[in-house]
Amino acid sequence: AEEQLEGGLRTAKDGPAAAKAAVRFHLRTSKGPEREGCYLSVGHSQPLEDCSFNMTAKTFFIIHGWTMSGMLENWLHKLVSALQMREKDANVVVVDWLPLAHQLYTDAVNSTRVVGLSVAKMLDWLQGKDGFSLGNVHLIGYSLGAHVAGFAGNFVKGTVGRITGLDPAGPMFEGVDIHRRLSPDDADFVDVLHTYTRSFGISIGIQMPVGHIDIYPNGGDFQPGCGLNDVLGSIAYGTIAEVVKCEHERAVHLFVDSLVNQDKPSFAFQCTDSNRFKKGICLSCRKNRCNGIGYNAKKTRNKRNTKMYLKTRAGMPFRVYHYQMKIHFFSYKSVGAIEPTFYVTLYGTNAESQVLSLEIVEQIGLNATNTFLVYTEEDLGDLLKIKLTWEGTSRSWYDLWREFRSYLSQPHRPERELSIRRIRVKSGETQRRLTFCVEDPEKTSIAPGQELWFYKCRDGWRMKNETSPTVEL
């Protein structure tokens, strides 16, 4: 390994030997989470006994990323606590590579391989112990730590059970060969959460899929609660850096959420891209097309690089309830090119939703079926009715100009009016399909500033029901 190890403090002619001194394994057992000096060292069995290492239990290795502070941040403390709460008998090992991570980013990147090798050597040594199985090992790496986990999985003798990449670092890893970054070959199951990907500027998190399943919450870019306004509102001197930290670190908090809020699991849905997901096209659970996220993600027989999407709340618990809405807009009059703004309110047996906007990803198709994605933060129960509202002041200047011109050339100004007979709804979480019809079949038209009510008239869409995620997973 010709990498520089300690940003000038130590050079790596002796690579792994130098790294050995720069990487510590801090065992955090549930019996004594605050216990000091619980450091594991290859070849030294005493700490395993002293610190109650359970050879037959699951073993988690948490690997931090680049640091500017030289300390282990609070996300790590939260993750350790959450793992100990969920898996009471498990061994939780924090991989402390601060000496190499508290350097220039480029130097830290150059150290990831040698730190991965150090983790692999620890795992190889543990494999020699009675009862220890590599299949029980779960490496969890955040940012640069995700690639360290990848290298560890690549170098270890055998196959690690699972690697979770929490927003793996993008710079210097995007687009590189699989042996130079986290990849599906590094463990039996590699699941990844991407929360800070950007197609413009620097993408702190890697954009490309690097695991068996790659989950992109909220499209993998703008995370709710992390906007500049949110950050400025809660931080005395909010900065772009705070937004970056919020979005990048969101991956960790989603994982923590999956550990502590077992009763509110979030589901992600397979989709080719974010735009199609935003259109509501991808809410299927057939053929492993949906999965739990974070700790609850299940290994599927799918081939690698499955991209999955979901929406989330701004804070814990992050779970939302996804609905696909199919609406056929009939147009009997010459309405021209319109850009209507529609809102829906869903009414269920448990609660009613807030007023939800129907996001038009491209353009409304007239005399065609349009698909939308809406999501609610609360569990509405079984849906009973839907109120659809067409906002009154949604006309663009272009629309107004067209109408003015058509008014001059025609005796009657064309009405902006559409007709909707029914709304078909599918719940992502339950996979139930329902049809909602207008109360009076004679009154199906809606114009700007008006509302239409739809009541449940049919279970299903006259199609075979799909399996629900709760059954499948």
């Epitope: 510590r24 000096g37 450091y39 502070s69 300390m71 609070n74 601060l98 508290h102």
Partner: antibody, heavy 120, light 107 residues
């Protein structure tokens, strides 16, 4: 028993420099970080910065970036803070405190404090 | 930086009293709140970490509570050695910051 023993009081002239020491005992020096805290007369506490004795990595409060330099001598389990270009504003009690390597760890043991007086 | 506010700078109480000292953060600090006691001779001791976790050797009459931005330290049965100055400190975000202190004096 964990102990942090700080050097004695200092009386210096403006413009001078001073190096305060903090000798740790009763625990493995490299397992924790050492932090420095300033308390001006009758005022609150201000975090100056920290050093990780394991590898010598430091991080200072922006306010003290040009004022304080933190170092360690692992062989004697001693941490040092050098304050330069002293002014009357630097007159205060300076504490060293031990903290785990996690942000979330508290300052669990403190030195007795070193009184610095800067006067012409 | 996160501002830590201890609105009561001074508090008078009698032996055996129950007193509560409050501390407010300028933003949510996720329970990363520690309490320290400073004696008149300058000695500083940790009392409580992570909002409510009693440090080893600290008497059980000390307790901490709170969440979000509002936290408090309660001393249930005041003893003579408890008359001192109490500081809160957040460990959520760098730079670490302290409250201005509450001086507890004997009535």
């Amino acid at each position: 028993e964990v102990q942090l023993q700080q050097s004695g009081p200092e009386l210096l002239k403006p413009g001078a420099s001073v190096k305060i020491s903090c000798k740790a005992s009763g625990y493995t020096f490299t397992d924790n970080t050492i932090h420095w805290v300033k308390q001006s007369h009758g005022k609150s506490l201000e975090w100056i910065g920290h050093i990780n004795p394991y590898y010598g990595g430091t991080n200072n409060n922006e306010k003290f970036k040009d004022k304080a330099t933190l170092t360690v001598d692992k062989s004697s389990s001693t941490a040092y803070m050098e304050l330069r270009s002293l002014t009357s504003e630097d007159s205060a009690i300076y504490y060293c405190a031990r903290k785990g390597i996690y942000y979330s760890s508290p300052f669990d043991y403190w030195g007795q404090g070193t009184t610095l007086t800067v006067s012409s | 930086d996160i501002q830590m506010t201890q609105t009561t700078s001074s508090l008078s109480a009698s032996l055996g009293d129950r007193v509560t000292i409050s501390c407010r953060a300028s933003q949510d600090i996720n329970n990363y709140l520690n309490w320290y006691q400073q004696k008149p001779d300058g000695t500083v001791k940790l009392l409580i970490s992570y909002t409510s976790k009693l440090h080893s050797g600290v008497p059980s009459r000390f307790s901490g509570s709170g969440s979000g931005t509002d936290y408090s330290l309660t001393i249930s049965n005041l003893e003579r050695e408890d008359f001192a100055t109490y500081f809160c400190q957040q460990g959520n975000t760098l730079p670490f910051t302290f409250g201005s202190g509450t001086n507890l004096e004997i009535k």
